[in-house]
């Protein structure tokens, strides 16, 4: 046959040679010819490639800079990045994790949805009625109203999304 | 198109030693392909002797080892063969190859 | 070393013959990736080799297709499929997989 046009599953064609490609973990030092293999060498220590590959240079792993509040959650390996999570109370900006922000709180009449992650930012949610928040937080859920009956008590002051019901005792002259 | 030209040869004395060269042109000897030496006795077949790598390492013939030496000057883009203690039996063309291309060859005659 | 014998040793023939050399390897010539080094070249009274087949069975730039190689492990050929005048030369197998690279004894193709 006259050399070939396409290639298999890792390799690749270069000079009408169907060459193979470097592992992940290695990169390419120099391309097969008629009568040599594909020569691949070992990435560095901080390198990496993650797929089978003819890069003639590795990737730097992700570096986890603590003054942007990063911090290493997965060290890398010649066939992975390192990946970065933030320091407690912190969260990332993107799906890359370039940078942290302080986690948001919820404000007085919202409370805590979801608490955050090293990767998403709080989620909060209006007190719904009979329910409230007096508090800016990271963490409070939105607290019940408290149940004047059950202490056989009774609503003296209306309950609002920032302030519990205020109790007290009923009145001795009704019948 | 990649061209090699050989020099050096000739008329050797026993236990002398000989310098071939190859200049090659049409394509870095340091950009890939290995580099080899092959010779040819007079009326006989093919031997390989060894190659010079484009990243300047080598390989022998075991049989050849302890007497021959591939080297390089990348500047003149040219490979060398250095062979030592000659006998009657290393007569020959010497050739040199990236083996799709090859020399015009040189004749090596060791005789007193 | 992976010993190469190619057979026949010489062999007469007519133009339009269809013409097969072989060559076998005393060691598996597949390497891990695969992949086989196996070539063949051409080689006519005083003139250096010509590559004509390269990696079992891939025809070099510029060989006509009358010229074909197969096999695998250790054992090929070269198929000429109708001989021409000017194929009457001898032919070389060639292993590049292991060091020391080897070469057959050589197939002389004579005109009958």
């Known amino acids: 046959p006259e050399p070939p046009t396409a290639c298999r599953e890792k390799q690749y064609l270069i000079n009408s040679q169907c060459c193979s490609l470097c592992q992940p973990g290695q990169k390419l030092v120099s391309d097969c010819t008629e009568f040599t293999e594909t020569e691949c060498l070992p990435c560095g220590e901080s390198e990496f490639l993650d797929t089978w590959n003819r890069e003639t240079h590795c990737h730097q792993h992700k570096y986890c800079d603590p003054n942007l509040g990063l911090r290493v959650q997965q060290k890398g390996t010649s066939e992975t990045d390192t990946i970065c999570t933030c320091e407690e109370g912190w969260h990332c900006t993107s799906e890359a994790c370039e940078s942290c922000v302080l986690h948001r709180s919820c404000s007085p009449g919202f409370g805590v949805k979801q608490i955050a992650t090293g990767v998403s930012d709080t989620i909060c949610e209006p007190c719904p009625v009979g329910f409230f928040s007096n508090v800016s937080s990271a963490f409070e859920k939105c607290h019940p109203w408290t149940s004047c009956e059950t202490k056989d008590l009774v609503v003296q002051q209306a309950g609002t999304n920032k302030t519990d019901v205020v109790c007290g005792p009923q009145d001795r002259l009704r019948a | 198109e990649v061209q090699l030209v050989e020099s050096g040869g000739g008329l050797v004395q026993p236990g002398g030693s000989l310098r071939l060269s190859c200049a090659a042109s049409?394509?870095?000897?340091?950009?890939?392909?290995?580099w080899n030496w092959v010779r040819q006795a007079p009326g006989k077949g093919l031997e390989w002797m060894g190659y010079?790598?484009?990243?300047?390492?080598?390989n022998y013939n075991p049989s050849l080892k302890n007497r021959i030496t591939i080297s390089r000057d990348t500047s003149k883009n040219t490979f060398y063969l250095q062979m030592n203690s000659l006998r009657a039996e290393d007569t020959a063309v010497y050739y040199c190859a990236r083996l799709d291309y090859w020399g015009q060859g040189t004749l090596v005659t060791v005789s007193s | 070393d992976a010993q190469m014998t190619q057979s026949p040793s010489s062999l007469s023939a007519s133009v339009g013959d269809r013409v097969t050399i072989t060559c076998r390897s005393s060691?598996?010539?597949?390497?891990?990736?695969?992949?086989?080094?196996l070539n063949w070249f051409q080689q006519k009274p005083g003139k250096a080799p010509k590559l004509l087949i390269y990696?079992?069975?891939n025809r070099f730039s510029g060989v006509p297709s009358r010229f074909s190689g197969s096999g695998s492990g250790t054992d090929f050929t070269l198929t000429i499929s109708s001989l021409q005048p000017e194929d009457f030369a001898t032919y070389y197998c060639?292993?590049?997989?292991?060091?020391?690279?080897?070469f057959g004894q050589g197939t002389k193709l004579e005109i009958k």
């Open positions: 060691q598996s010539l597949e390497n891990t990736n695969g992949n086989t080094f």
């Open positions: 990696r079992v069975s």
């Open positions: 049409g394509y870095s000897i340091t950009s890939n392909y290995y």
């Open positions: 010079i790598r484009y990243d300047g390492s080598n």
């Open positions: 060639l292993q590049v997989t292991h060091v020391p690279f080897t």
